[in-house]
């Protein structure tokens, strides 16, 4: 039985050219996390495997950085990055848990200034 829940950073409005951190946290389960996939609209951005570590998809290498933790840092944001991002936790024995975050990237004059800065 899957008892866990995923908590996310919540939806984010950010500024073009800035950077943001996407994070998910799996709680309320003792299941072992074997791998976390980060995806956007059916595109794989990155994988964090418990044994093999991080793999960033080649097409995102310049703008995606691993961490902090199992999270993902997106840099040099463009308006085209607007969309839904998924953290997919593969666990044993529970199976798969998915968290969702919607990121809105706006021209500089519109976005909230707070999203320019990374979480300490």
């Amino acid at each position: 039985m899957m008892t866990g829940t995923i908590e996310t950073t919540g939806n984010i409005s950010a500024e073009k050219g800035g950077s943001i951190i996407l994070q998910c946290h799996l709680s309320s389960t003792t299941a072992q996390v074997t791998q976390v996939n980060w995806e956007q609209q059916d595109q794989l951005l990155a994988i964090c495997n418990a044994d093999l570590g991080w793999h960033i998809s080649p097409s995102f290498k310049d703008r995606v950085a691993p961490g902090p933790g199992l999270g993902l840092t997106l840099q040099s944001l463009t308006v085209n990055d607007t969309g839904e991002y998924f953290c997919i936790y593969h666990t044993y024995p529970d199976g798969t848990y998915t968290g969702r975050i919607f990121l809105e990237v706006l021209e500089s004059s519109v976005a909230e200034h707070g999203a320019r800065f990374q979480i300490p």
Epitope: E7, T9, N11, Q41, G83, E84, R100, L106, V110
Partner: antibody
């Protein structure tokens, strides 16, 4: 003046599919998200999903995944929602609503499209 | 999904009254950057819903200053300082911090 003009009321048979349109005017269509909301008989409102006209990206309420398909035609500044395999549970008023930039709210709404599913 | 609970379900009023509507969420609506995406809408019969308040406390363009929003975390309130006839209808809060966005069940503001 910001306007969202939706297509007219529909009476459809169970099992059929249909498409509602939402024509935007008075603003830059690709600079905003477009949300779709269902209002059922009991007055409750449910978020169906949204589409990003700029890149075609979508986000769905999992409850409506497979029931609703969202698309846009940038050339005519029109958003569409197709409803599939209709049942009586889908009888409702459907609204399109523009996303308020920065604050994740819905600032302008279409007039609503009433859908009745009946044999 | 985040559950949003609105109280009361029905609010009988007289013109000139001051009223409050409460909205509670099952988890905090503050995102990791400190922004809270909680908005309020008025839905009048035969019309489309209209945005009143966004980001907890910001009045939308053209909304009279008798409407005010407050709150933080999981607890939010819409206040109407002096009820006028055009204020009657269904009020909804909406959380848009977590996917999917979820509405409260609504509060019907009606004449006593």
């Amino acid at each position: 003046e910001v306007q969202l003009q939706q297509s007219g009321p529909e009476l459809v048979k169970p099992g059929a599919s249909m498409k509602i349109s939402c024509k935007a005017s008075g603003f830059s269509f690709t600079a905003y998200t477009m949300n779709w909301v269902k209002q059922s008989q009991g007055d409750n409102l449910e978020w169906i999903g949204l589409i990003v006209p700029y890149n075609g990206g979508t986000s769905y309420n999992l409850k409506f995944k497979g029931k609703a398909t969202l698309t846009v035609d940038k050339s005519s500044s029109t958003a569409y929602m197709e409803l599939l395999s209709l049942t009586s549970e889908d009888s409702a008023v459907y609204y399109c609503a523009r996303g308020l930039q920065r604050f994740f709210a819905m600032d302008f709404w279409g007039q609503g499209t009433s859908v009745t599913v009946s044999s | 999904d985040v559950v949003v609970t609105q109280t009361p379900l029905s609010l009988p009023v007289s013109f000139g009254d001051q009223v409050s509507i409460s909205c509670r969420s099952s988890q905090s609506l503050a995102n990791s950057y400190g922004s809270t995406y909680l908005s309020w809408y008025l839905h009048k019969p035969g019309q489309s819903p209209q945005l009143l308040i966004y980001g907890i406390s910001n009045r939308f363009s053209g909304v009279p200053d008798r409407f005010s929003g407050s709150g933080s975390g999981t607890d939010f309130t819409l206040k109407i300082s002096t009820i006028e006839p055009e204020d009657l209808g269904m009020y909804y809060c909406l959380q848009y911090t977590h996917q999917p966005p979820t509405f409260g069940g609504g509060t019907k503001l009606e004449i006593k």
